[in-house]
């Protein structure tokens, strides 16, 4: 019961996390900027992984997509890649985990197969969460190191001057959504991995005493079959006994003090 709950909760948490990663990737507010030196109107600029937007206090808003792939900063490309990998892994993980859920019966799927699938999806969720956290962190680091209060001046060779606009670059909402979503996916993945341990059937050795009818060569031996999981080495389903007692493969059974009860 606890295993099913852990697995189900892990699935739900991961589902919410992956939805958050998708939302963060699509959001425009990765970086927000106030353009200080504009004497006309308050200009608010915000940028995502796919497009940049300008919003003015007058209500005017315009967004423009980054239509080129080659000219963009390498960091932006890296963040895009990390987020997409996170989404793809998460989506595959969700698909696998649906079939792995203990509460869903699919044909004659054994618990061992479900355990394997649960572990696989858990690992995928963990990697997906890490990708999202890494992507968001790389972007945040890019903002902090490269852009915080840029005010440097420079001059062009054409004689016209160019200077960087004094802007305050702040973390956009998407960064926080991404961090939380990545964390949730990670936690969900860990929960799935924990649930996997409970799902995996244990190999139980049943100890049995051999009962022999006197003067007969066939031994009656109750119980003693190893639980067949497909993982163990007991391929012939031989009975397992204490103290080196003989198996039924042996031709002859000799009387012992245990034969007469």
């Amino acid at each position: 019961m606890a295993v099913t709950a852990c697995q189900g909760l892990g699935f739900v948490v991961s589902l919410i996390g992956i939805a958050g990663i998708i939302a963060a990737t699509c959001m425009d507010q990765w970086s927000t900027q106030d353009l200080y030196n504009n004497p006309v109107t308050a200009v608010f600029n915000y940028q995502g992984l796919w497009r940049s937007c300008v919003r003015e206090s007058s209500g005017f808003t315009e967004c423009r997509g980054y239509f080129t792939l080659l000219g963009l900063p390498a960091m932006l490309q890296a963040v895009r890649a990390l987020m997409i990998v996170g989404i793809v892994l998460g989506a595959i993980g969700l698909l696998v985990s649906i079939f792995a859920l203990k509460c869903i019966r699919i044909g004659s799927m054994e618990d061992s197969a479900k355990a394997n699938m649960t572990l696989t999806s858990g690992i995928m969720f963990i990697v997906s969460g890490l990708c999202a956290i890494a992507g968001v962190s790389v972007f945040a680091n890019m903002l902090v190191t490269n852009f915080w209060m840029s005010t440097a001046n420079m001059y062009t060779g054409m004689g016209g001057m160019v200077q960087t606009v004094q802007t305050r670059y702040t973390f956009g909402a998407a960064l926080f959504v991404g961090w939380v979503a990545g964390g949730l996916t990670l936690i969900g993945g860990v929960m799935m991995c924990i649930a996997c341990r409970g799902l995996a059937p244990e190999e139980t050795n049943y100890k049995a005493v051999s009962y022999h009818a006197s003067g007969h060569s066939v031994a009656y031996k109750p119980g003693g079959f190893k639980a067949s999981t497909g993982f163990g080495s007991n391929t012939k389903n031989k009975k397992i006994y204490d103290g080196g007692a003989r198996t039924e493969d042996e031709v002859q059974s000799y009387p012992s003090k245990h034969d007469y009860v």
């Epitope: 353009l35 006309v40 109107t41 200009v43 007058s58």
Partner: nanobody, 122 residues
């Protein structure tokens, strides 16, 4: 990489009109505010008029009612229609644009043109 080219300056009589234009070219991603500044001999550079991408305009008090700023976002061009010109309007007029580049759409730059001379004299 990015060029701002002003045109339309010249000599005009008091009360006359001129239309300045400034075209931005190069690897521009998005232009936000565009404006005109002027610098008279021996004076500081001052704002004449500025217009945002959305069309919100602002003028210095001395030109209000006489000058009109407009822009064409598709052409990355800003215009300054100057009517009822006075001798005190004589200056070098500089075009200015806040923009970001295709190679770095996360950083804003202010580019300036080289200026065009406007002389109001009888």
């Amino acid at each position: 990489q990015v060029q701002l080219v002003e045109s339309g300056g010249g000599l005009v009589q008091p009360g006359g009109s001129l239309r300045l234009s400034c075209a931005a070219s190069g690897s521009i991603f998005l232009i936000n505010a565009m404006g005109w500044y002027r610098q008279a001999p021996g004076k500081q550079r001052e704002l004449v008029a500025v217009i945002t991408r959305g069309g919100s305009a602002n003028y210095t008090d001395s030109v209000k009612g006489r000058f009109t700023i407009s822009r064409d976002n598709a052409k990355n061009t800003v215009y300054l229609q100057m009517n009822s010109l006075k001798p005190e309007d004589t200056a070098v007029y500089y075009c200015n644009a806040d923009l970001n580049l295709r190679s770095d759409p996360f950083k804003w730059y202010t580019f300036w043109g080289q200026g065009t001379q406007v002389t109001v004299s009888s």
